[in-house]
């Protein structure tokens, strides 16, 4: 079979098939017969991740402080900065362009998994035999006391909000 | 300017191998198969097989299928032909040469517009 | 593979001659032919491409014909540094495969 297109790091112009510039460079010049490609680096703070023939670099992502982000990872010229929020904040999307605060679990849930830089808090109902009495970001279900192991018996039954209530089983005489 | 420097001559036993290394400068080295041939004394050029600098992927002559081992180093912008097992037949000059597509008249060509001065390898007990 | 047959396998000329190479291909490979020039001691170059495109460069004298199986190359009027060994070589698929070579003497 014959050749049907240039090859993968290649771009076709004025009939020849010339090299794309590397990550982390941008295109000066296209080749011709007699000349390569032309590629120069990013700058600072520019980068290009792929094969391009890109004319300009793109800007390394700001961290915003004012909207509670930090750099989680420079950037090179060959990889964009990644951004992450500050303790108690998530990123409202996957490109982490702001924050916001972890939300807490309402009394009645619990914690299923911790907030992280990226990721809100997850929430899950306390099952039964499980409360929680508090609006926390951290607290887990707590399991309701068992009151047979101290000898005492229920008094009132515990709900996904509240724990049992214990007290002295009834003596007969 | 564009250029590839081959390595220098070779003496070799049978039996033996031989690793040729082929240096690119003046183009982006990943960006371009490099071809290696041969051609034995008085006589015409055999294609041995190409890899492609990027990857690494190769391709090589049916021929020459489990003797021969292309690589390269991008970071040197470097490609290596290994022979192994050779024979007296083997002796030939071995060129490393630029693949360079082209379109022209609504189809593409591929030609070797740079190639490397050659290396001669010597087989001989 | 493809097979590529060259004639004449050597030839003759003076300068100022006119010279014809010819080169039959075993299948059809349209017009993917490239004519290259080695001289004594050195790596092949390209000469045309594909079948009968010069190369800026190439002086006009060279010129290449054909399709399909059967093609040419033409030196019109044969000059010192134009002594050497002329190949051509298929494109078309892989491997590809060179004609034998045509050397061309001084007469």
């Known amino acids: 079979e014959p050749p049907t297109a240039c090859r993968e790091k290649q771009y076709l112009i004025n009939s020849q098939c010339c090299s794309l510039c590397q990550p982390g460079q941008k295109l000066v010049s296209d080749c011709t017969e007699f000349t390569e490609t032309e590629c120069l680096p990013c700058g600072e703070s520019e980068f290009l991740d792929t094969w391009n023939r890109e004319t300009r670099c793109h800007q390394h992502k700001y961290c915003d402080p004012n909207l509670g982000l930090r750099v989680q990872q420079k950037g090179t010229s060959e990889t964009d900065t990644i951004c992450t929020c500050e303790e108690g904040l998530h990123c409202t999307s996957e490109s982490c362009e702001s924050c916001v605060p972890h939300r807490s679990c309402l009394p009645g849930f619990g914690v299923k998994q911790i907030a992280t830089g990226v990721s809100d808090t997850i929430c899950e109902p306390c099952p039964v035999g499980f409360f929680s009495n508090v609006s926390s970001a951290f607290e887990k279900c707590r399991p309701w006391t068992s009151c047979e192991t101290k000898d005492l018996v229920v008094q009132q039954a515990g709900t996904n909000k509240t724990d049992v209530v214990c007290g002295p089983q009834d003596r007969q005489r | 300017q564009v250029q590839l420097v081959q390595s220098g001559a070779e003496v070799k036993k049978p039996g033996a191998s031989v690793k040729v290394s082929c240096k690119a400068s003046?183009?982006?080295?990943?960006?371009?198969?490099m071809y290696w041939l041969r051609q034995a004394p008085g006589q015409g050029l055999e294609w041995m097989g190409w890899?492609?600098?990027?990857?690494?992927?190769?391709n090589y002559a049916q021929k020459f299928q489990g003797r021969v081992t292309m690589t390269r180093d991008t970071s040197i912008s470097t490609a290596f032909m290994e022979l192994s097992r050779l024979r007296s037949d083997d002796t030939a000059v071995y060129y490393c040469?630029?693949?360079?597509?082209?379109?022209?008249?609504?189809?593409?060509?591929?030609?070797?517009?740079?190639w490397g001065q050659g290396t001669t390898v010597t087989v001989s007990s | 593979d493809i097979q590529m047959t060259q004639s004449p396998s050597s030839l003759s000329a003076s300068v100022g001659d006119r010279v014809t190479i010819t080169c039959r291909a075993g299948q059809n490979i349209s017009r993917h032919l490239n004519w290259y020039q080695q001289n004594p001691g050195k790596a092949p170059k390209v000469l045309i491409h594909p079948a009968s495109s010069l190369p800026s460069g190439v002086p006009s004298r060279f010129s290449g014909s054909g399709s399909g199986t059967d093609f040419s190359l033409t030196i019109s009027s044969l000059q010192p540094e134009d002594f050497g060994t002329y190949f051509c070589q298929q494109s078309y698929s892989t491997p590809p495969t060179f004609g034998g070579g045509t050397k061309v003497e001084l007469k």
């Open positions: 040469a630029r693949e360079k597509p082209r379109y022209f008249d609504s189809f593409y060509y591929y030609l070797m517009d740079v």
């Open positions: 890899i492609n600098p990027d990857s690494g992927d190769t």
């Open positions: 003046g183009y982006t080295f990943p960006g371009y198969y």
